[in-house]
């Protein structure tokens, strides 16, 4: 009876269980009734980080100096290269694919502390009664317009991203 499932670190092919290739190696040929799975080590600047049946290794990430990137940790046959930014610059994401001098605060957030040479911008959510409708690296949350002081009434409520909309009071006849 041919198997329908295989053990861990195996895969099912042609009704039989073959061993997966270990991290750092790629698949050359599947096992047969008479032969083991054939695997080959990844080449220079390549890697595979899991037990696999991949026929091609992945290229190591390139830390492009034109984007302000440099190598934080060199890749191996089992791990990808880890990039970081030049000193004084900040990664734009976990994957660190580009660098910015400092982050900006998105709409709905205000700048709590402007970036310095040693610390990035600190953002804070706009509390009730305040808003920010821009991305900025220096602007704080702004208070909602006070309609009452203009002898107007609130026609549309404000949010953390929008100001209130004021309008004329309904006059009683």
């Amino acid at each position: 009876e041919p198997p329908t499932a295989c053990r861990e670190k195996q895969y099912l092919i042609n009704s039989q269980c073959c061993s997966l290739c270990q991290p750092g190696q790629k698949l050359v040929s599947d096992c047969t009734e008479f032969t083991e799975t054939e695997c080959l080590p990844c080449g220079e600047s390549e890697f595979l980080d899991t037990w696999n049946r991949e026929t091609h290794c992945h290229q190591h990430k390139y830390c492009d100096p034109n984007l302000g990137l440099r190598v934080q940790q060199k890749g191996t046959s089992e791990t990808d290269t880890i990039c970081t930014c030049e000193e004084g610059w900040h990664c734009t994401s976990e994957a660190c694919e580009s660098c910015v001098l400092h982050r900006s605060c998105s709409p709905g957030f205000g700048v709590k502390q402007i970036a310095t040479g040693v610390s990035d911008t600190i953002c804070e959510p706009c509390p009730v009664g305040f808003f920010s409708n821009v991305s900025s690296a220096f602007e704080k949350c702004h208070p909602w317009t006070s309609c009452e002081t203009k002898d107007l009434v609130v026609q549309q409520a404000g949010t953390n991203k929008t100001d209130v909309v004021c309008g004329p009071q309904d006059r009683l006849r």
């Epitope: 660098c99 910015v100 900025s136």
Partner: nanobody, 116 residues
């Protein structure tokens, strides 16, 4: 492609004035917050001044408050920094930068030297 071209630097005596310009192209200038950032010899980058897209709100570092004025002309796609009462410690390469400050979007800068 974003291009920022700074100009107006030079040698000036302490107490003197300079006006820096930054000609922007490759993006919709009027939509972006803009900054002046400087780097003194052997030092890190220092944020000097910023201006919102409409030119209605500004920021100044404490070290330049009352002496420097940032402005912009959205019809000319140009950012300015008027620098008065210059001091030796203002000597630096001055860069203009646009949000969100990508490394590859920086210009070459313009050198300001304050010396007698």
């Amino acid at each position: 492609e974003v291009q920022l071209l700074e100009s107006g630097g030079g040698l000036v005596q302490p107490g003197g004035s300079l006006r820096l310009s930054c000609a922007a192209s490759g993006f919709t200038f009027r939509d972006y917050e803009m900054w002046w950032v400087r780097q003194a010899p052997g030092k890190g980058l220092e944020r000097v001044s910023a201006i919102n897209p409409q030119g209605t709100r500004t920021y100044y570092a404490d070290s330049v408050k009352g002496r420097f004025t940032i402005s912009r002309d959205n019809s000319k796609n140009t950012l300015y920094l008027q620098m008065n009462s210059l001091r030796a410690e203002d000597t630096a390469v001055y860069y203009c930068a646009k949000l969100p400050f990508y490394f590859q979007e920086w210009g070459q800068g313009t050198l300001v030297t304050v010396s007698s």
